[in-house]
């Protein structure tokens, strides 16, 4: 730029560029003013007159310094599974984000295009990885000594309670039930006396697909990773 401050429109010196709030107009071959956020170029500059800017109309915006002939249209209204976290103004687009209990399955530059409900882990399964704004809940089977008796997108597997005397052993979907009486020789029918330290966890059986009165043998099966949908409900 020349020592004297240049006012738009001006011809840049050879090899120099326009200032940050200016653009080079190829037709006029001049540095011309950009329009501010919330405005657009109504009339482009000439050699003798600068850009004429005008405010964006309702439901349109420009977020940056620009020389676009028309403002951009704001996105459509947020859907029922979304909340509007930023309103459409002359300077910014509407931003929709997923409401609580949902996550963004398909994002866009700002906000979310498609929301989906967070997976709920069914009884016998707990949350291995919580849901975030952009990722679903991951469920895992409750490990021996832990359980989850809820259908939830937030509950983790919790340890079984520790019994001196176990009335009903815990499994993956149910806590252990302790006897209220102190250990005696004559034990209540069905009660299992565990001659172990108090800190020992109760017995545990893995969840099975179907309820069964037969003793569970699933603990004999290899415990590999479960398929993605296992342990989750569709609701």
């Amino acid at each position: 730029l020349p020592a004297q401050v240049a006012f738009t429109p001006y011809a840049p010196e050879p090899g120099s560029t326009c200032r940050l709030r200016e653009y080079y107009d190829q037709t006029a071959q001049m540095c011309c003013s950009k329009c501010s956020p919330g405005q657009h170029a109504k009339v482009f500059c000439t050699k003798t007159s600068d850009t004429v800017c005008d405010s964006c109309e309702d439901s349109t915006y420009t977020q940056l310094w620009n020389w676009v002939p028309e403002c951009l249209s704001c996105g459509s209204r947020c859907s029922s599974d979304q909340v509007e976290t930023q309103a459409c103004t002359r300077e910014q687009n509407r931003i929709c984000t997923c409401r609580p209990g949902w996550y963004c399955a398909l994002s866009k530059q700002e906000g979310c295009r498609l929301c989906a409900p967070l997976r709920k882990c069914r009884p016998g399964f707990g949350v291995a990885r919580p849901g975030t704004e952009t990722s679903d809940v991951v469920c895992k089977p409750c490990a021996p000594g832990t359980f989850s008796n809820t259908t939830s997108s937030t509950d983790i597997c919790r340890p079984h309670q520790i019994c001196n005397v176990v009335a009903i052993p815990g499994n993956a979907s149910m806590d252990a039930v302790c006897t209220s009486t102190s250990p005696t020789r004559s034990m209540a029918p069905g009660a299992v006396h565990l001659p172990q330290p108090v800190s020992t966890r109760s017995q545990h059986t893995q969840p099975t697909p179907e309820p069964s009165t037969a003793p569970s043998t699933s603990f004999l099966l290899p415990m590999g990773p479960s398929p993605p949908a296992e342990g989750s409900t569709g609701d």
Partner: antibody, heavy 118, light 110 residues
Framework: QSVEESGGRLVTPGTPLTLTCTVS????????ISWVRQAPGKGLEWIGI?????NTAYATWAKGRFSISRTSTTVDLKITSPATKDTATYFC???????????????WGQGTLVTVSS | AYDMTQTPATVEVAVGGTVTINCQAS??????LAWYQQKPGQRPKLLIY???DLASGVPSRFSGSGSGTEYTLTITGVECADAATYYC????????????FGGGTEVVVK
Amino acid sequence: QSVEESGGRLVTPGTPLTLTCTVSGFSLSSNAISWVRQAPGKGLEWIGIINTYDNTAYATWAKGRFSISRTSTTVDLKITSPATKDTATYFCARDVHNNVVPYYFDMWGQGTLVTVSS
Amino acid sequence: AYDMTQTPATVEVAVGGTVTINCQASQSISNLLAWYQQKPGQRPKLLIYDTSDLASGVPSRFSGSGSGTEYTLTITGVECADAATYYCQQGYSSSNIDNVFGGGTEVVVK
């Protein structure tokens, strides 16, 4: 080329006061003008701006308390109802652009002192 | 809002030393930042515009840098004449703002 402020004086609270920025050596046809103030011992505080199309913008705290207007050679700042907190030196400054968003100021006046006291 | 926060409020520097003044915007101002110098009883003087471009007649010991929300004014080889208060100013938006200027940094030269 210069800009010069005038009209600063001692006023009582609530008495409207108009300050004037007069330009010389250049035309007001291509530049926005801002008003900036500085309370004693404090920093610079932008009040507002007017461009050649008579479009204006104000700081949030200045809306309703100040009004900027212009002629071909002057820009006025009206303090609608001065309060003691408005005691300051008031500067006018030439913007290098003509938008109501200040770009940068290449020319400043020497300032005019306004004292609001009862 | 595009609030401008300047740090430190005061800085002491020896003659010949280097001083760095920081200016942080509450959101990106796309390098539309200017710096001014003001000495007691005087009008402000433009030093730098567009983050790093020196205004006419400003010594090269003044330099500016930064992007997004973080900007810096650096004075290397400080001279006694550099004792002043320095202000940053954003040139991005005037919508819903309290001040385009930062709070100022007083440079004391020892």
